[in-house]
């Protein structure tokens, strides 16, 4: 039994880090493998993660972590019974994938303006709370070509757009994701999408 693709890990910079790897053949990850992880400092405890299958030869492990700080560094040991298959380390602050934003809501009652709001996925004391920027994806359910991305580079989790920038009388969906420039993070997963019917008053044309 050998590791084909070494574990790569990402942290939500709060409570979970997720590690994925591939074995050289079909593996029952939960019965055959264990991933041990330990914070590097004197007297720290070793924790054991039981991996789950992620495709035939793929494994994934969710490592529970206390509040992450930038100095945290973990040793990782992948075991198959008594055999050490791989040894590595992981610094959560250097491999961050933010949590997805939540509670995306489209407010259509503001005169001819769409107000999209969502929730920052971090509590105020978390470092990422004040460092997230967002991308909002809006698309038409009727027309696959009607697909747009709005970059929200300010801190407020909201976006205003004129309803008239979208077609009237049809349904749209929106979703949002986050990233943090300060930690050069990857993008979060997209939030669940929300749907609304776009309608607005056409401007009166004078001839």
């Amino acid at each position: 039994m050998k590791v084909l693709q070494e574990p790569t890990c990402v942290s939500d910079y709060m409570s979970i880090s997720t590690c994925e790897w591939k074995m050289n053949g079909p593996t029952n990850c939960s019965t055959e493998l264990r991933l041990l992880y330990q914070l590097v400092f004197l007297l720290s405890e070793a924790h054991t993660c039981i991996p789950e299958n992620n495709g035939g030869a793929g494994c994934v492990c969710h490592l529970l972590m206390d509040d992450v700080v930038s100095a945290d560094n973990y040793t990782l040991d992948l075991w198959a019974g008594q055999q050490l298959l791989w040894k590595g380390s992981f610094k959560p602050s250097e491999h961050v994938k933010p949590r997805a934003p939540g509670n995306l809501t489209v407010h259509t009652n503001v005169s001819d303006t769409l107000l999209l709001t969502w929730s920052n996925p971090y509590p105020p004391d978390n470092y990422l709370y004040n460092h997230l920027t967002y991308a909002v994806n809006i698309w038409s359910e009727n027309d696959p070509a009607d697909f747009r991305i709005y970059n929200v580079t300010y801190l407020e989790p909201s976006l205003r757009i004129a309803a008239s920038t979208l077609k009237s009388g049809i349904s749209y969906r929106a979703r949002v994701r986050a990233w943090a420039r300060c930690y050069n993070t990857t993008w979060s997963e997209w939030s669940p999408s929300t749907k609304w019917h776009n309608s607005y008053r056409e401007p009166f044309e004078q001839h």
């Epitope: 409570s15 400092f41 939540g102």
Partner: antibody, heavy 115, light 107 residues
Framework: QVQLVESGGGLVQPGGSLRLSCVAS????????MNWVRQAPGKGLEWVSY????????YYADSVKGRFTISRDNAKNSLYLQMNSLRDEDTAVYYC????????WGQGTLVTVSS | DIQMTQSPSAMSASVGDRVTITCRAS??????LAWFQQKPGKVPTRLIY???SLQSGVPSRFSGSGSGTEFTLTISSLQPEDFATYYC?????????FGQGTKVEIK
């Protein structure tokens, strides 16, 4: 091995105060965020409060906000819950529980609020 | 605040039965969900975290699934020591909230 031992519970009248303590051993307390969780007699679990190891930030359940204060003394390996303006509905066994996500619990201390 | 609704609140089952307990969150919590077991007079112990990750030392007959708002704890073949109360917990945001519990009793 990890051990959490609560103390300070007892009988108190409505409107009174109590201070609960939780002494930790078997791990580096200063590196761990901590929680208080309670359970009223015959009822379910209710999260009460949290204190971060990283920032010292604190969070509370709405039911205790403004009345309870969580704190810690890393030099004494101790977690505290100062409970003021106690009500009948605060009667419960109070547990301290360690992060991440309540991986270790103390045995609990009973707080009874009654006249 | 996020509400966690567990069902059923109580159930009777026999040794060897397959038992399923569900937990519904009032809003999306991704996979930030854990399951705990509590026996009478004892302290709760964590069975599952991150919705589907089995806690080390917990028998493999316990499994968790779900994401978003719908979650399930399954005991594939109920053993005598599994008669207890089970709680789900969301830790996606503060305040953290538990489900009201599911008591699994002997039929």
């Amino acid at each position: 091995q990890v051990q959490l031992v609560e103390s300070g519970g007892g009988l108190v009248q409505p409107g009174g105060s109590l201070r609960l303590s939780c002494v930790a051993s078997g791990f580096t307390f200063s590196h761990s965020s901590m929680n208080w969780v309670r359970q009223a007699p015959g009822k379910g679990l209710e999260w009460v409060s949290y204190i971060s190891r990283a920032t010292g930030a604190v969070y509370y359940a709405d039911s205790v906000k403004g009345r309870f204060t969580i704190s810690r003394d890393n030099a004494k390996n101790s977690l505290y819950l100062q409970m003021n303006s106690l009500r009948d509905e605060d009667t419960a066994v109070y547990y301290c529980a360690r992060e991440p996500v309540f991986d270790y619990w103390g045995q609990g201390t009973l707080v009874t609020v009654s006249s | 605040d996020i509400q966690m609704t567990q069902s059923p609140s109580a159930m009777s089952a026999s040794v060897g039965d397959r038992v399923t307990i569900t937990c519904r969150a009032s809003q999306d919590i991704s996979n930030y969900l854990a399951w705990f077991q509590q026996k009478p007079g004892k302290v709760p112990t964590r069975l599952i975290y991150a919705a589907s990750s089995l806690q080390s030392g917990v028998p493999s007959r316990f499994s968790g699934s779900g994401s978003g708002t719908e979650f399930t704890l399954t005991i594939s073949s109920l053993q005598p020591e599994d008669f207890a109360t089970y709680y789900c917990l969301q830790w996606s945001s503060y305040p953290r909230t538990f489900g009201q519990g599911t008591k699994v009793e002997i039929k």
